[in-house]
């Protein structure tokens, strides 16, 4: 087929999709034109499974990523629930436009959020020392609308300061009790989430939380003797 005479712009380079926790952000390198005073604008389109292509605008995906001068499209900026359903097989494409001219489409490899996401550490970690125990509470890295489809389980990596690391888990609960610890000893720990997607038997191992250390409480009987 003869080349499209209007398809004379260079295409955006190195597009990448960031899937971190609930975030879905497409970014790319700008198209630089030395001979134009007008800004290059970009259009993003999406499709899923067998659908046709749709322009990424407020009505279709809740964010305007058409005729934009920015070099990123954050599908999740509007609200926690904004963005593509996490089990959808989504393909994105992108082109540059300048007046009637446009570049060729650059099509990204398809993604599924649950399949490709980078899972961060659990958040808001709170630890309550007990007698020879530590009670750990935290929130999940991100919200899952339908927990029958996908869910988090958690692991705690812990060790007595200077000792050997142990792992406890998996737990479904956002509250974990480490029992049978020595009283009046300092223990360090990290919490880790793992995302399990039932439909495809896929699991994504999350990042470890920062190391934090706590001293268990003294044994009540020991305190009485003192």
């Amino acid at each position: 087929a003869p080349p499209d005479p209007l398809s004379q712009l260079p295409a955006p380079q190195h597009p990448k999709i960031r899937l971190y926790n609930a975030e879905q952000v497409l970014s790319w390198e700008p198209v630089a034109l030395s001979n134009s005073t007008r800004p290059v604008v970009y259009q993003v389109q999406f499709k899923y499974t067998d659908s046709k292509w749709f322009t990424a605008d407020i009505m279709s995906i809740g964010v305007n990523c058409t005729q934009i001068t920015a070099t990123e499209c954050d599908f999740t900026a509007a609200s926690p629930s904004a963005g593509f359903p996490m089990d959808f097989n989504v393909t994105l494409r992108l082109r540059a436009e300048l007046g009637a001219l446009h570049s060729a489409w650059v099509t990204m490899p398809w993604f599924q959020h649950y399949r490709n996401v980078t899972v961060g550490p659990p958040e808001n970690i709170e630890v309550t020392p007990g007698e020879g125990s530590l009670i750990i509470r935290f929130s999940s890295p991100f919200d899952i609308a339908d927990t029958s489809t996908a869910f988090f389980c958690y692991y705690v990596h812990y060790w007595e300061k200077g000792g050997i690391q142990q792992v406890k888990g998996p737990f479904r609960s956002n509250s974990i009790s480490l029992d049978n610890l020595k009283p009046s000893r300092v223990y360090c720990l990290q919490v880790q989430a793992q995302l399990l997607w039932n439909k495809s038997n896929i699991f994504r191992v999350g990042h470890l939380s920062n190391i934090s250390c706590y001293e268990t409480m003294a044994d009540a009987s020991t305190e009485l003797q003192q």
């Epitope: 046709k52 407020i58 009505m59 279709s60 995906i61 489809t149």
Partner: nanobody
Framework: QVQLQESGGGLVQAGGSLRLSCTAS?????MGWFRQAPGKQRELVAR???????DYADSVKGRFTISRNTAENTAYLQMNSLKPEDTGVYYC????????????????WGQGTLVTVSS
């Protein structure tokens, strides 16, 4: 300001038909209908996606049909073989595609139109 305007509710005898209409102020990716029966939770009845896909609640499959005029941003719910248990307030809903797709949590809601099916 997003607006959803419903019409077509009313009183009908069991076995009869009604057609609900909903006009939106924009071409939203998903449009659909929920209903709330007295003393019950609001439930999805049917929805239509811009690619032509439709979903129905099990209780209305084969009796209700959702359709859409994309050019006019209007969705219709054709309700046939109505039963007394179909009685309730029917709400039009619309919004973009989002993570809240299943179960659907729409961005925008209409005021509702009452459908009463008498036996």
């Amino acid at each position: 300001q997003v607006q959803l305007q419903e019409s077509g509710g009313g009183l009908v005898q069991a076995g009869g038909s009604l057609r609900l209409s909903c006009t939106a102020s924009g071409a939203y990716f998903i449009m659909g209908w929920f209903r709330q029966a007295p003393g019950k939770q609001r439930e999805l009845v049917a929805r239509t996606i811009r690619d032509g896909t439709t979903d129905y609640a099990d209780s209305v499959k084969g009796r209700f049909t959702i359709s859409r005029n994309t050019a006019e941003n209007t969705a219709y719910l054709q309700m046939n073989s109505l039963k007394p248990e179909d009685t309730g307030v029917y709400y039009c809903a619309a919004g973009p595609l989002s993570k809240s797709f299943a179960p659907w949590d729409p961005a925008y809601w209409g005021q509702g139109t009452l459908v009463t099916v008498s036996s």
